[in-house]
C-alpha cells in the first residue's frame, strides 16, 4: 500500500461509513440482536484536549492497543455468531466486513510507520492500562468500532499525517 494512503481522509471515512451501516442494520442498541456473552472492547470516549496534549507516541500505544482489542472482540463476535442457530446473513456480512476493515487499517498504520512509536526505551514509564468496557449487543459492538475510528484513530492519523506534511 502507498505509505500515506491513510492520510487520504476518504479512506478512513469509507471504513467509518461501513461501521455506521453495520450499527444501523442491527436495529438499534436496545432491542437489536444480543451477544450470547459480554465482550470486552476499548473505551472510545475522548476528552479532546487531553488527547491532543498526549505525545504522539502515547497516542500510538492507545490506538494499537485499541485496534488489537477491537479485532479480538469482533473475532469473538464472529465465533459466537457461528455457534448460534441460523445466524442472520446481514449480520455475518457486516462482521466479515469489520474484520476485513480492521486488517486493512492495521496494515495501513503499519505502512505509515506507526509501529515505530511503540518501541519505547526500557526506562520509560509504562503506558496507563487501556480503559475498557463490555458490550452485550452487536449494535453496541459496531458503535464502538465506528467511534474508535471516528475518534482516537482519526485524531491519531491526522496528527501523524500533519507532521509528515511539514
Amino acid at each position: 500500500a502507498p505509505p500515506r494512503l491513510i492520510c487520504d481522509s476518504r479512506v478512513l471515512e469509507r471504513y467509518i461509513l461501513e461501521a455506521k451501516e453495520a450499527e444501523n442494520v442491527t436495529m438499534g442498541c436496545a432491542e437489536g440482536p444480543r451477544l450470547s456473552e459480554n465482550i470486552t472492547v476499548p473505551d472510545t470516549k475522548v476528552n479532546f484536549y487531553a488527547w491532543k496534549r498526549m505525545e504522539v507516541e502515547e497516542q500510538a500505544i492507545e490506538v494499537w492497543q485499541g485496534l488489537s482489542l477491537l479485532s479480538e472482540a469482533i473475532l469473538q463476535a464472529q465465533a459466537l455468531l457461528a455457534n448460534s442457530s441460523q445466524p442472520p446473513e446481514t449480520l455475518q456480512l457486516h462482521i466479515d466486513k469489520a474484520i476485513s476493515g480492521l486488517r486493512s487499517l492495521t496494515s495501513l498504520l503499519r505502512v505509515l510507520g506507526a509501529q515505530k512509536e511503540l518501541m519505547s526505551p526500557p526506562d520509560t514509564t509504562p503506558p496507563a492500562p487501556l480503559r475498557t468496557l463490555t458490550v452485550d449487543t452487536f449494535c453496541k459492538l459496531f458503535r464502538v468500532y465506528a467511534n474508535f475510528l471516528r475518534g482516537k484513530l482519526k485524531l491519531y492519523t491526522g496528527e501523524v499525517c500533519r507532521r509528515g506534511d511539514r
Epitope: N47, F48, G151
Partner: antibody
Framework: EVQLVQSGAEVKKPGESLKISCKGS????????IGWVRQMPGKGLEWMGW????????RYSPSFQGQVTISADKSISTAYLQWSSLKASDTAMYYC??????????WGQGTLVTVSS | SYVLTQPPSVSVAPGKTARITCSGD??????AYWYQQKPGQAPVLVIY???KRPSGIPERFSGSNSGNTATLTISRVEAGDEADYYC??????????FGGGTKLTVLG
Amino acid sequence: EVQLVQSGAEVKKPGESLKISCKGSGYSFTSYWIGWVRQMPGKGLEWMGWIDPYRSEIRYSPSFQGQVTISADKSISTAYLQWSSLKASDTAMYYCARVSSEPFDSWGQGTLVTVSS
Amino acid sequence: SYVLTQPPSVSVAPGKTARITCSGDKLGDHYAYWYQQKPGQAPVLVIYDDSKRPSGIPERFSGSNSGNTATLTISRVEAGDEADYYCATWTFEGDYVFGGGTKLTVLG
C-alpha cells in the same frame, strides 16, 4: 492562582471593528488552550472557538466561523477575539476561559460588548 | 451540528435531591461536562469527564452519562445551589457544545 483578566466593556456602532483581550497569569500560558464563549442578554452559553497558543492551532464553532477572529500573543500571555464589522446582534457578554483536561476550568470576568447606533 | 437539550427549569425543595438532564444523540459515547452560573457571575465547572469533580466542588454534586442522557445530581440541595446549569460535550472533531441551560429554583 490562575487568573484570566479581560479588557473592559465596549460600546460600539454597527460596522465598527473591535478587538478584546484576555490575559492569563498564574500558570504556563502555552501549556493550556484559551476558549471563547458568548452569552447574549438573558440567554445561554455558546462556544465560539479555542486556540492553542503553543501551536497556534485554532478551531472555530461552525456558527462563528468567518464572523470573528481568534488569535494569541504568547510573549505577553494574551488571547484576543476580534470583529472586523460589528452588528447589533453581536451585543453580548464575551468570556474567555482556560481549556485543560477539565475544560473551561478558569474563566475571565467577561467583557460586555454593546453594539448600537 | 451536535445539539444538547436541557429542560428550561427544575424546582426542588431544600434538602432534597435535584436531577438535571441533558440529552443528545448518543451522548453516552462522549464525555459530559457541567457548569454552574449564578446571576452576574462567570460559569464554574462542577463536573467533568461524566462524573469527576474539580477540587473545591462539594461531594453533593455528581454526574452520570449513558445512552442519550447525561444527568447532574445535586443531593441535599441548599439555597446557594440556585443557579443556571449548563451541560457540554466535546465532539470527536474538537468542537465544544453547550446545552441550552436549566434554571434550578430552590423552593421556599
